[in-house]
């Protein structure tokens, strides 16, 4: 709204860089043939690029990326008791970012 | 995949808790009514709940909640050159979470 | 408030067959994931668990004890009870019944009886 | 089967002192299965501790804490108090065996 400023802090733009965010490990990552499961830890912190660049044209990338293999449990009611097997998900966490060119769409032929 | 654990480390969960998240300021937060102006910065960091809980009957929620006017530029084009306006947009930030019981959809009367 | 008491006698002859009654208030077997278990203990020795009835009528059992062990409910009267038949001196124990859930968290014995003790003598 | 091994079969502790319990699983099965931990005084039922390897149970004080995975499993008291000298059992189960108990461990005074 175009009103009173008196105690609005000038808004900083929230830069081009990684943050923490939250990646839901889904069922399909570890199983796809079964529903009966389910999978812990749920969800894991990996570091991703987020925030805005000074134009349109430009978008927040990620420069260099790794692979990071974390083990869960999948855990299965069997005779009503709860046994478990470990797994591995692999994570992608961004190092590093940058504002870059956005590609145009190539027309389709 | 249940493959080879060698590399990899036990998943720590997510925990439910506040983490920066970059917040999108929409034109129409600005202007309903006009779409032929940008706003700068277009986004700008808030502290939100994230995270996973213990189960699917639970999750993160605020439990607290602050409100922060922040002061934007609405720029117009009139007559080839920029006009800027200052405009207050109101922005929500989570001071503190908890995993909280849902509550089950009410039947549909 | 989850309670639960066991009964029975405090005596009983080599061979015969004893029958314990655990009794339960506080929540319902009938509930998804809810049973009943018995575990036993020897004077001065160690837990020894015996069987488990589910709300689904499920029965898993020592496979060491199988043949003498038999478990059933009654639902509508919140009661749990176990025979065991050909007992012997060495059956001699203090005879517990817990509630257990199947989680996916957990498989543990939450809430106890205080345990009837049992002998076994001619 | 799985067989659960206690260890030490006595500690003799004093209070205020940090007591560490172990509990060792043998193997075997391609699957893991959780460990609960309870406590037993004289004459009394034993009361859950621990679940699911690591969570207290509801109303027990954050001085007990249970840790490990696989086959190794430990259940700390940080602090003992005078009314933590006790029997302490693990529990754990399997798909054909069901439940197993540990043989205990005695935690008494010094």
């Known amino acids: 709204s175009l009103g009173s400023l008196t105690i609005a802090e000038p808004a900083m733009i929230a830069e081009c860089k990684t943050r923490t965010e939250v990646f839901e490990i889904s069922r399909r990552l570890i199983d796809r043939t079964n529903a009966n499961f389910l999978v812990w830890p749920p969800c894991v912190e990996v570091q991703r690029c987020s925030g805005c660049c000074n134009n349109r044209n430009v978008q927040c990338r990620p420069t260099q990326v790794q692979l990071r293999p974390v083990q869960v449990r999948k855990i299965e009611i069997v005779r009503k008791k709860p046994i478990f097997k470990k797994a591995t998900v692999t994570l992608e966490d961004h190092l590093a970012c940058k504002c870059e060119t956005v590609a145009a769409a190539r027309p389709v032929t | 995949s249940l493959g080879s654990l060698t590399i990899a480390e036990p998943a720590m969960i997510a925990e439910c808790k506040t983490r920066t998240e970059v917040f999108e300021i929409s034109r129409r937060l600005i202007d309903r009514t006009n779409a032929n102006f940008l706003v700068w910065p277009p986004c700008v960091e808030v502290q939100r709940c994230s995270g996973c809980c213990n189960n699917r009957n639970v999750q993160c929620r605020p439990t607290q909640v602050q409100l922060r006017p922040v002061q934007v530029r609405k720029i117009e084009i009139v007559r080839k050159k920029p006009i800027f306006k200052k405009a207050t947009v109101t922005l929500e930030d989570h001071l503190a979470c908890k995993c909280e019981t849902v509550a089950a959809a009410r039947p549909v009367t | 408030e989850v309670t639960l008491r066991e009964s029975g006698p405090a005596l009983v002859k080599p061979t015969q067959t004893l029958t314990l009654t655990c009794t339960f208030s506080?929540?319902?077997?009938?509930?998804?994931?809810?049973?009943v278990g018995w575990i036993r203990q020897p004077p001065g020795k160690a837990l020894e668990w015996l069987a488990n009835i589910w709300w689904d009528d499920d029965k898993y059992y020592n496979p060491s004890l199988k043949n003498r062990l038999t478990i059933s409910k009654d639902t509508s009267k919140n009661q749990v009870v176990l025979t065991m038949t050909n007992m012997d001196p060495v059956d001699t124990a203090t005879y517990y019944c817990?509630?257990?859930?199947?989680?996916?968290?957990?498989?543990?014995?939450?809430?106890w009886g205080q345990g009837t003790m049992v002998t076994v003598s001619s | 089967e799985i067989v659960l091994t206690q260890s030490p079969g006595t500690l003799s502790l004093s209070p205020g002192e940090r007591a560490t319990l172990s509990c060792e699983r043998s193997?075997?099965?391609?699957?893991?299965?959780?460990v609960s931990w309870y406590q037993q005084k004289p004459g009394q039922a034993p009361r859950l501790l621990i679940y699911?390897?690591?969570l207290r149970a509801s109303g027990i004080p954050d001085r007990f804490s249970g840790s490990g995975s696989g086959t190794d499993f430990t259940l700390t008291i940080s602090r003992l108090e005078p009314e933590d000298f006790a029997v302490y059992y693990c529990?754990?189960?399997?798909?054909?065996?069901?439940?197993?108990f540990g043989g205990g461990t005695k935690v008494e005074i010094k």
């Open positions: 699911a390897d690591d």
């Open positions: 506080g929540f319902s077997l009938s509930t998804y994931g809810m049973g």
């Open positions: 193997s075997g099965s391609n699957y893991d299965t959780y």
């Open positions: 529990q754990s189960y399997g798909i054909e065996t069901d439940i197993v």
């Open positions: 817990a509630r257990i859930e199947s989680h996916w968290w957990s498989y543990a014995f939450d809430y």
